[in-house]
């Protein structure tokens, strides 16, 4: 019965970009301005998303697809479909309630979003420190100390424990 009814339903003939207008004897009417229908057979059109304030339009709304937003420079998207915009920080910082703060010694952030993370502990993999970390960059791990023969090509001696100019924060 359901299948029979759907076959007889005149609304099922209405394509995307239109809606089945009950006020006009169920004929297919185009979606009004600033609205869309992405599938056929819809009885109403959805209101287009408007990208305002910190949001900017990445893709304009059409009769068959919603607008897509991203964030203005200095902000980045969070959430499905860029539902929120969050302030960017510099590399080597993280966003706190009080704004962007430098990563503490022993942590780094190589991106403009997210949190400062602890440097990699090379010894967990039985490796040695090849290059020290900074607040912007992680430690680089090299071959395990036992692998190092005199003149081994891919290793330089470990640098001092703290890079010049990077005091504990």
């Amino acid at each position: 019965f359901e299948r029979t009814r759907s076959l007889q339903d005149p609304c099922s003939n209405c394509p995307a970009g239109t809606f089945c207008d009950n006020n006009r004897n169920q004929i297919c009417s185009p979606c009004p301005p600033n609205s869309f229908s992405s599938a056929g057979g819809q009885r109403t059109c959805d209101i287009c998303r408007q990208c305002k304030g910190v949001f900017r339009t990445r893709k304009e709304c059409s009769s068959t697809s919603n607008a897509e937003c991203d964030c203005t420079p200095g902000f980045h998207c969070l959430g499905a479909g860029c539902s929120m915009c969050e302030q960017d920080c510099k590399q080597g910082q993280e966003l706190t309630k009080k704004g962007c703060k430098d990563c503490c010694f022993g942590t780094f952030n190589d991106q403009k979003r997210g949190i400062c993370r602890p440097w990699t502990n090379c010894s967990l993999d039985g490796k040695s420190v090849l290059v020290n970390g900074t607040k912007e960059r992680d430690v680089v791990c090299g071959p395990s100390p036992a692998d190092l023969s005199p003149g081994a090509s891919s290793v330089t001696p470990p640098a001092p424990a703290r890079e010049p100019g990077h005091s504990p924060q």
Partner: antibody, heavy 127, light 110 residues
Framework: EVQLLESGGGLVQPGGSLRLSCAAS????????MSWVRQAPGKCLEWVSV????????YYADSVKGRFTISRDNSKNTLYLQMNSLRAEDTAVYYC????????????????????WGQGTLVTVSS | QSVLTQPPSASGTPGQRVTISCSGS????????VTWYQQLPGTAPKLLIY???HRPSGVPDRFSGSKSGTSASLAISGLRSEDEADYYC???????????FGCGTKLTVL
Amino acid sequence: EVQLLESGGGLVQPGGSLRLSCAASGFTFSGYDMSWVRQAPGKCLEWVSVIYPDDGNTYYADSVKGRFTISRDNSKNTLYLQMNSLRAEDTAVYYCAKHGGQKPTTKSSSAYGMDGWGQGTLVTVSS
Amino acid sequence: QSVLTQPPSASGTPGQRVTISCSGSSSNIGNNYVTWYQQLPGTAPKLLIYADSHRPSGVPDRFSGSKSGTSASLAISGLRSEDEADYYCATWDYSLSGYVFGCGTKLTVL
């Protein structure tokens, strides 16, 4: 030995879609960042997208943002690139690349470079 | 145009030393590790240098990398005919939230 085998390339019309796959073997796939890098005929390398194994985070080049989607299936050791709304300028050889630095021990792979590459698959966008 | 600037070509004779430069900015080379790739004709790229100056095992010590400020360099000493290839620098760019490649330098061994 690291092996990466791309497939899914071919001829597609502008506005069309393609899905590329990259079958990985010889390493613990679930422990490494994976990227797609492309090279138009006679042109330079262009990074397309990366996916992290630990948090599933993805990043895209501005030229493909909103059109391409990178994904991975760690149970199948396979990397994917879904390409929609293709344009003539997307014509290129697409390489799958493995990053160095195994996660979660390594926090960031950017120092270690892309130490494993496939042979590439050609995508041609033309009417 | 690429975010990282490389000379389009370089050349040298066998046995010579050649240097290829790669120039960027504080958002990429200045605060991130540089990697170098070699692409022989008709093949996929191969990692040559990682973390600015370190060689993966199997890469000859004729290849060396260095970095100063927002520029990086790849030096090849004792040039050989088999070194004829395209060489690319690459790094992470935090402001773009992505990796960036230079447009490559074609090395010709005369």
